[in-house]
């Protein structure tokens, strides 16, 4: 209709980075930009994804290097994290959120793909990391090894080997394990503090240089108390599980202090593993009963999990695996290991800004049934798995509904703001839910719509439209881009209109009748009034049309609804040669060239395209007859 197809601005980028996967218009104090997601962009050796800022009229795009943003205190893995897969603009302050739903971090032997987002302020500066699903690793442990270095320990090299071997089993790194070592005899010394080394390699290197300090007395109680009161303080982390490993070869010379020392360790929640080395007793034929009782007293209960004894120093190597396994069985404490909560949640797969924060779709949450999380300045709201049971019953829990594949919100005059989320794999046909979130981690689900066709991916794209601009949502559009019809993946967009409190189905939008795959409804954008009739409009992308070149459809709003026949279909081939997947993303909220008309930004594979609006001239014809 009135979108100019002759002089588009085609902004080139990397196809391999999928520059153009997401696009957003951006305004900084009157300067207009496009923010373009390139989720496969490379940073150094890692395919982190990134976001570009592109000037609207001319000039080159600049990478924001958000892929370099690092989270401290986690062992993160940023490769393939898909930064830019979702973008959400906050029109209030012109900040935006760029998400990396496949961002993961190392936890023990696992990588947890919790996802994370970067908040970027209006002048393109990174301001904050948003990662509501990020939880502390179960391997978030401060481990202090308390080594008896008194004269009777022999040969020391065996103790060293044991130390090195056990350290090699530890997942040492930010957000995981820290290790400190103290050695005692008559006195106690720090060999190294908890925060001295940040990798297994460095800790092992330091441990290999620990020499036996000797001493005629074995002050085990003092060694334990020193570890509790000093070693866990120097470099210890708030909230880290405290683990102490005591290795000794004889009764302590301060055993009457053990009761108080152990009580204090219990109060500090220090889990104690104790290893009795019987070499001295066996070499001299002494009954070790009193010694063994003492070591069992030192070890946390139950003894069978925390107490070890070895025949001599050389036999220490035999307990390395068992000790390591026992320590890491702490990982699974009170957890059902067959099920995932937020560990694989992929938070930020979709994002949507609301008044008090941001909604983030987490398709991998709760065993890939999905969830929607909310981050606000006051904290985060993570609904419990049970909150969704009304619409996502237990019997379908292994189906992987992917709730949160897309998120948005609607406003009704009765209920105010209500959140909307799509679950395109629910029961194979897809589902959309409308809900409100509560701070007690529960949800109220007000309405649910179900897809018709298996595999249609109903709910993978959702857009709410306020046609008349009165602040109340008029229409909810739900895409099912894989809808199969006439032997092809044609796609379908369902129209729901708000009647009192419910959205009522009111047909589908019409696409063109080609005989190729189209995926009509892969992207749906509510855009501001394009044709200057004072009604807001809608643009739908069909990125597989015309042999994957892509096309977009413009639908006009009219009197609280939407006209179901497109007013304009724009194909990629009209605009430039070589465009592919044109229409995979769409945004149209700003006048980019200051002609008073709203312009469109459309993403394609390796390109972002700006389409300029043309003015609409309305001619009112009137006839006058003379003589009348």
């Amino acid at each position: 209709f009135n979108m100019d197809t002759r002089k588009p601005r085609v902004i080139p980028g990397s196809r391999t980075a999928f520059f153009g996967y997401t696009v957003q218009q951006h305004d900084i104090s009157g300067n207009k930009w496009l923010v373009v997601g390139a989720p496969l962009e490379t940073n150094g050796y890692q395919k982190t994804g990134d976001v570009y800022k592109c000037p609207v009229i001319h000039g080159n795009c600049t990478k924001l290097n958000l892929g370099r943003v690092t989270l401290s205190n986690v062992s993160e893995r940023k490769d393939n994290m898909r930064l830019g897969l979702s973008l959400a603009t906050n029109p209030k302050d012109n900040s935006f959120l760029a998400c990396s739903p496949l961002w993961s971090h190392e936890c023990g032997s696992s990588y947890y793909t919790t996802g994370m987002c970067s908040r970027v302020n209006s002048n393109f500066r990174f301001s904050k990391t948003v990662a509501p699903a990020l939880q502390r690793c179960q391997t978030y442990m401060d481990i202090v090894i308390v080594l008896d270095g008194s004269n009777s320990i022999y040969p020391w090299v065996e103790v060293q080997h044991f130390l090195i071997n056990i350290l090699k089993k530890f997942y040492i790194g930010p957000g995981q394990i820290q290790v400190g070592v103290v050695q005692y005899g008559e006195d106690v010394v720090h060999e190294f503090h908890l925060n001295d080394y940040r990798s297994v390699k460095d800790v092992v290197e330091a441990a290999s240089h620990i020499e036996q300090r000797g001493g005629t007395e074995t002050r085990t109680a003092f060694g334990i108390e020193f570890a509790r009161s000093e070693a866990f303080q120097k470099g210890g982390r708030k909230g880290a599980k405290k683990v102490m490993i005591v290795i000794t070869d004889g009764e302590s010379h301060d055993s009457p202090d053990l009761e108080k020392v152990i009580q204090q360790s219990e109060r500090d929640n220090v889990t104690r593993y104790a290893v009795a080395v019987l070499g001295y007793y066996n070499r001299r034929g002494i009954n070790p009963e009193t010694f063994l009782n003492e070591i069992k007293y030192i070890a946390s209960d139950p003894d069978d999990k925390h107490f070890f004894n070895v025949t001599d120093e050389a036999a220490l190597k035999d307990i390395v695996d068992a000790l390591g396994d026992r320590i890491f069985s702490l990982e699974g404490t009170n957890k059902n290991e067959t099920s995932f909560g937020l560990e694989m949640s992929q938070t930020g797969f979709s994002s949507h800004v609301v008044e008090d924060g941001v909604l983030l779709g987490a398709v991998g949450a709760y065993d890939w049934n999905g969830a929607v999380l909310k981050e606000t300045s006051a904290g985060k709201v993570i609904p419990l798995r049970e909150s969704y049971l009304k619409e996502f019953p237990e019997e379908l829990k292994n189906h992987g509904a992917y709730l949160g594949y897309t998120v948005t919100s609607v406003v009704s005059s009765r209920q105010g703001r209500v959140y909307v989320a799509g679950a395109p794999r629910f029961n194979h046909t897809g589902k959309v839910i409308l809900f409100t979130m509560h701070n007690n981690r529960s949800l109220t689900i007000h309405q649910a719509m179900r897809g018709q066709q298996i595999g249609s991916y109903f709910g993978s794209e959702i857009t709410s439209v306020d046609i008349d601009g009165d602040g109340v949502t008029d229409v909810l559009l739900v895409g099912a881009p894989m809808y199969f019809n006439e032997g092809r993946e044609r796609g379908k967009v369902y129209v729901y209109e708000l009647r009192q409190n419910l959205f009522v189905y009111n047909g589908t939008l019409k696409d063109s009748h080609s005989y190729q795959n189209a995926r009509f409804g892969s992207s749906i954008a509510s855009v501001r009034d394009l044709n200057q009739d004072s009604y807001n409009d809608v643009v739908v992308g069909a990125p597989l049309e015309d042999n994957h070149a892509g096309a977009i459809y413009i639908f006009h709003g009219f009197r609280g609804s939407i006209l179901k026949t497109p007013k304009q279909r724009i194909t990629a081939s009209e605009l430039a040669t070589g465009l592919q997947y044109f229409g995979c993303s769409i945004h149209g909220q700003l006048d980019l060239n200051e002609d008073g008309l709203i312009d469109l930004a459309v993403g394609a594979l390796g390109n972002a395209v700006i389409l300029w609006s043309r003015p609409v001239v309305q001619i009112n014809a009137s006839l006058h007859f003379e003589p009348s």
């Epitope: 301060d254 055993s255 009761e259």
Partner: antibody
């Protein structure tokens, strides 16, 4: 030669205070525990308090808890028993004794005792 | 708290007699039980430690044994210098709380 010598005993009025000293020689106070044990006239031995000179951990009998304080000054190789709010029933001979690993946690050396009389 | 019940509270015996004094612990305890001898006006002296180990310088006629929660001091052949009061003492494991028995006075018959 190991020796323990108590001093500081005497006559005190009920409610009064007294500080007993136990000077150790022939061994390092740091490597042992000191216990105070008392014996009322014609009665048996009653354990009073103990201290680890190294860690400063203390233990007290219920009968003296909150009134008596045991301490040690390793630089002087001396242990102390500060007795406050004294009562008539605290009248006894007070002994200090060494307790350590090498005697398998028995009181192997005792002082000669010092008499504390609480009377108005 | 563990109580140590010593019996008898007194006994009369003659030189050359075999004398047995028993201490019963109110609950299961470690072997950290010691026996002391005290003569009037003197400080107690250690005889036996760890229930059955003879302290250095103590005559071999003194011996100690354990059976469950019962601890026994035996003087195999009573000598004139052995007339005194005997105390058992138990050390609470891993603390320096100690408990004495009430004492047994061994008198000349």
């Amino acid at each position: 030669e190991v020796q323990l010598v108590e001093s500081g005993g005497g006559l005190v009025q009920p409610g009064g205070s007294l500080r007993l000293s136990c000077a150790a020689s022939g061994f390092n106070l740091q490597s042992s525990y000191i216990h105070w044990v008392r014996q009322a006239p014609g009665k048996g031995l009653e354990w009073v308090a103990s201290i680890s000179s190294y860690s400063s951990y203390t233990y007290y009998a219920d009968s003296v808890k909150g009134r008596f304080t045991i301490s040690a000054d390793t630089s002087k190789n001396t242990a102390y028993l500060q007795m406050n709010s004294l009562r008539a029933e605290d009248t006894a001979v007070y002994y200090c004794a060494r307790y350590w690993y090498y005697s398998a946690w028995a009181l192997d050396y005792w002082g000669q005792g010092t008499l504390v009389t609480v009377s108005s | 708290d563990i109580q140590m019940t010593q019996s008898p509270s007194s006994l009369s015996a003659s030189v050359g007699d075999r004398v047995t004094i028993t201490c019963r612990a109110s609950q299961s305890v470690s072997s950290a039980v010691a026996w002391y001898q005290q003569k009037p006006g003197k400080a107690p002296k250690l005889l036996i430690y760890s229930a059955s180990s003879l302290y250095s310088g103590v005559p071999s006629r003194f011996s100690g044994s354990r059976s469950g929660t019962d601890f026994t001091l035996t003087i195999s052949s009573l000598q004139p210098e052995d007339f005194a009061t005997y105390y058992c003492q138990q050390s609470a494991p891993y603390s320096s709380l100690i408990t004495f028995g009430q004492g047994t006075k061994v008198e000349i018959k």
